[in-house]
């Protein structure tokens, strides 16, 4: 059962796994959630009645019964991990802690104008987990405005002490705010020969890469496949680091694969969710339970629903045995990975899907599309919404994209003549406009947030957010699209589609069925040549065929330019402007979403 509230002046007795230091009980709960075994925690707040060496301790706990006896203790705050909850979870922590010094290895010291600048520096430094900044009121003159970047083995402070006139905080890498490169490639036949910080067992290089991503010290990895000559090292995932942040030596070795932490890509690809099944593979670990199950899918469901289960092995039923049910072995380990992986025994193994809620919902695979044709099918573009105005009469106004359970991203120019959000309606999961009747459910709009610098579409900043009055429950027909990672600025997208109910030619009407068109991206240099009277800025992105013929048009405005990359759809552009529609050598111009990720996150994550 999901318990989110914190229990004041309460301590859980026993069940200790480990002790870490966190600046708040709230963050202790996050740390517990991300720990492979932690189900409960007790945090000690600063208090005159408590020994200062125990202040800010966060004791992570586990229990077979999922609960522990409660004891009254002043300054203790206890609670449960969010593992038991179904809601989306994020490790993003933007809080700044005043008068706290978070201890760690101080590996970089520099002058910064503000705590915000120090935090940005930490976010864009590959090693940095957290920082402490001495303000200009700090007593020691030579330490004023000093920004200390810190890291530790666990990613959390080794101690936290009170210190006047300093502030501390965490890297915002987990908030998708890092400008560090996102390197998704996995390099075959390669070993990175740098120091190992940890090693775990993994069924393939992809799982190894995801484990590296959420390991605080891992910057890159090497994985030895099951064909690796040395038997004792097969399926071994080596988590690595180096001072420079890059591998110092690459050795060519067959049957080994290497890659990088996906730290800077984590909001646009799954890093926690290991959803594949591994056939003829057995995962070894501590046995939690053995249950009868009809299939390996059913076994995975059982593991996902058992909060302590981390991975499983399913052995299919022997002919007509046990009503055709096989055995489902629910397992766990100290680090969430199998202690050993065996092949050739006929088992089917996999991981709990409980961790998938730690990934962005937008990374979920959607059902395969029907390629060709211009009319879309239901569920093909589940992030696409139709924005209606009810004044003077109800009509389709613009397209938009679901980017969060309360947020639609669209174009600023859509709001010409819109006096208030009260006249707007957002319809999701719609294929045909004719489906929209009086009684069709819609989302009301609580707030329209237009970019401050928007003046006209041609001069850029053509971007707006709609905050919905109620939250969107994600289903197959309505779910979010990923924002591009800032680390992906150099990715060349080759599979881009524009969608909408807009005109099919310049003099036309709104279409009934959602239309789609595959359109190639055009470089900004090329686009600038086609629009000599305009300034095509880096905050714009263009798409179109040289000969014309396929393009967005009136009514498609605000809708997505969606590009598929590494099996995940990204919102690369927002339909903004263009000279006519589908004209030769006149590409469509879109708002370049990656350039507004900071703005989007600032607005959507504002308290």
């Amino acid at each position: 059962e999901c318990v989110t509230q914190l229990l004041k002046d309460t301590c859980f007795e026993g069940g200790d796994i480990t002790t870490v230091f966190t600046p708040s009980a709230k963050y202790c709960q996050v740390v517990c959630t991300y720990h492979p075994r932690c189900l409960l925690f007790t945090f000690t707040a600063e208090s005159p009645s408590e020994d200062p060496t125990r202040w800010f301790t966060c004791v992570l706990k586990d229990s077979v019964t999922e609960t522990l006896p409660r004891v009254n203790r002043t300054a203790a705050i206890s609670g449960y991990s969010f593992k038991q909850c179904s809601h989306q979870i994020s490790a993003c922590n933007k809080d700044i802690y005043v008068d706290l010094d978070m201890k760690g290895i101080n590996y970089n010291s520099s002058v910064a104008k503000s705590a915000q600048e120090c935090q940005e520096r930490c976010t864009d430094d590959v090693h940095c987990h957290f920082f402490t900044y001495a303000t200009r009121q700090f007593p020691s003159l030579e330490h004023r405005n000093i920004c200390l970047l810190k890291h530790t083995q666990t990613g959390t402070p080794t101690r936290i002490t009170k210190l006047d006139k300093v502030v501390s905080g965490f890297s915002l890498k987990s908030c998708a705010l890092s400008n560090l490169a996102c390197i998704r490639d996995i390099f075959p036949n390669t070993v990175f020969a740098d120091s190992n910080i940890d090693s775990v067992m993994a069924p393939d290089a992809f799982v190894c890469g995801r484990i590296c991503t959420h390991h605080p010290g891992c910057l890159f990895f090497t994985f030895f496949s099951q064909e690796w000559p040395k038997e004792s090292q097969r399926n071994l995932c080596l988590l690595k680091t180096s001072e420079s942040g890059l591998p110092s030596t690459r050795i060519k070795k067959s049957k080994a694969l290497s890659g990088f932490s996906l730290q800077s890509c984590r909001h646009s690809i799954p890093v926690f969710c290991h959803s594949s099944f591994y056939h003829d593979t057995d995962f070894l670990g501590e046995e939690l339970d053995i249950v009868a199950a009809k299939s390996h899918e059913a076994c995975q469901k059982l593991c996902t629903n058992a909060v302590r289960c981390q991975f499983f092995t399913y052995t299919p039923a022997q002919a007509s045995c046990n009503e055709g049910k096989g055995k489902c072995y629910l397992k766990l380990s100290s680090n969430g990975s199998p202690t050993k992986i065996l092949h050739g025994r006929g088992g089917i193994s996999g991981y709990t899907l409980r961790l998938c809620k730690m990934d962005n919902e937008c990374t979920t695979k959607i059902k395969p599309r029907i390629v060709g044709g211009t009319a879309s099918v239901r569920g093909e573009w589940p992030w696409q919404v139709t924005l209606h105005t009810t004044s003077p009469t109800q009509r389709h106004l613009c397209g938009g994209s679901i980017i969060g359970n309360q947020w639609i991203l669209t174009a600023a120019h859509c709001f010409y003549g819109v006096e208030s959000p009260k006249i707007l309606r957002v319809y999701s999961g719609i294929l045909n406009q004719s489906e929209i009747k009086e009684d069709t459910s819609f989302f009301g709009v609580q707030e329209i947030i237009i970019h401050d610098q928007y003046k006209m579409a041609e001069s850029g900043y053509d971007i707006a957010l709609l905050k919905l009055e109620t939250t969107v429950n994600y289903t197959d027909s309505q779910r979010p699209i990923c924002l591009p990672s800032k680390g992906d600025r150099n990715v060349i997208y080759t599979d881009c589609w524009v969608t909408g109910w807009g005109y099919r030619k310049l003099r036309d009407k709104i279409q009934n069925t959602l239309q789609k068109a595959k359109i190639p991206l055009v470089t900004n240099e090329e686009c600038q040549k086609r629009y000599r009277g305009h300034k095509i800025t880096h905050k714009m992105i263009c798409a179109g065929y040289r000969e014309g013929g396929k393009d967005a048009c009136k009514g498609d405005s605000g809708g997505p330019l969606s590009c598929k990359h590494n099996e995940v759809w990204h919102l690369v552009g927002i339909t903004s402007w263009g000279e006519g529609c589908a004209q030769r050598e006149r590409p469509g111009v879109y708002t370049n979403v990656v350039e507004y990720v900071d703005w989007i996150l600032e607005k959507t994550q504002a308290v």
Partner: antibody
């Protein structure tokens, strides 16, 4: 509720500089765009310029060399300054606010008549 | 700059009869973003102007449905299906597609 009120001198001598203030309430100048529009007696409306919500300005090209629009957000005021006034500049001066975008004009001040005469 | 030319400059209409005002632009007012930033305002005697129509044909809330707007590109029309006594005043078209923005010279509607 939303209000806009123009204030300033009713009489200005030729060659002098006109300074008009538009004081707003019920909204923030950093959230909406504010325009100045004038109307000589018995004549048509003329768009003069605007203060965008991000602090940028746009001007009527005919008046650009003589016109400055500025603002003081803490006082909720937008100021129009027009140099080298001439009798042909005698008009009712309005400030007006756009909707979500720069236009259409949803709210207008009541206007202030400025006469240019020696 | 865009010049908006309104015709006629004045018209006198019997209550209950229709009225039509034309507004012609020196350049197309279709914006590259798909919107046409053409608006109609009515200034009643002794009052500030009030919005009637935006985006060529969208009636602003509270505006009676006897008012309608149409047109595209450079030619636009405001129609009043049945003129009422309260409709007297000066009608202005206004464009915000091209910077600087401009008003038409106005059309005075009198009631016979």
């Amino acid at each position: 509720q939303v209000t806009l009120k123009e204030s300033g001198p009713v009489l200005v001598k030729p060659t002098e500089t006109l300074t008009l203030t538009c004081t707003v309430s019920g909204f923030s100048l950093t959230s909406y765009h504010l325009h100045w529009i004038r109307q000589p007696p018995g004549k048509a409306l003329e768009w003069m310029g605007l203060m965008w919500r991000d602090g940028d300005t746009s001007y009527n090209s005919r008046l650009k060399s003589r016109l400055t629009i500025s603002r003081d957000t803490s006082k909720s005021q937008v100021v129009l300054t027009m140099t080298n006034m001439d009798p042909v500049d005698t008009a009712t001066y309005y400030c007006a606010r756009g909707m979500t975008l720069a236009t259409p004009f949803l709210y207008w001040g009541q206007g202030t008549l400025v006469t240019v005469s020696s | 700059d865009v010049v908006l030319t309104q015709t006629p400059l004045s018209l006198s209409v019997t209550p209950g009869q229709p009225a039509s005002i034309s507004c012609r632009s020196s350049q197309s007012l279709e914006s590259s973003d798909g919107n046409t930033y053409l608006e109609w305002y009515l200034q009643k005697p002794g009052q500030s102007p009030q919005l009637l129509i935006y985006g060529v044909s969208n009636r602003f809330s509270g505006v009676p449905d006897r008012f309608s707007g149409s047109g595209s590109g450079t030619d636009f029309t405001l129609k009043i299906s049945r003129v009422e006594a309260e409709d007297l005043g000066v009608y202005y078209c206004f464009q915000a597609t091209r910077d600087p923005f401009t008003f038409g010279q106005g059309t005075k509607l009198e009631i016979k």
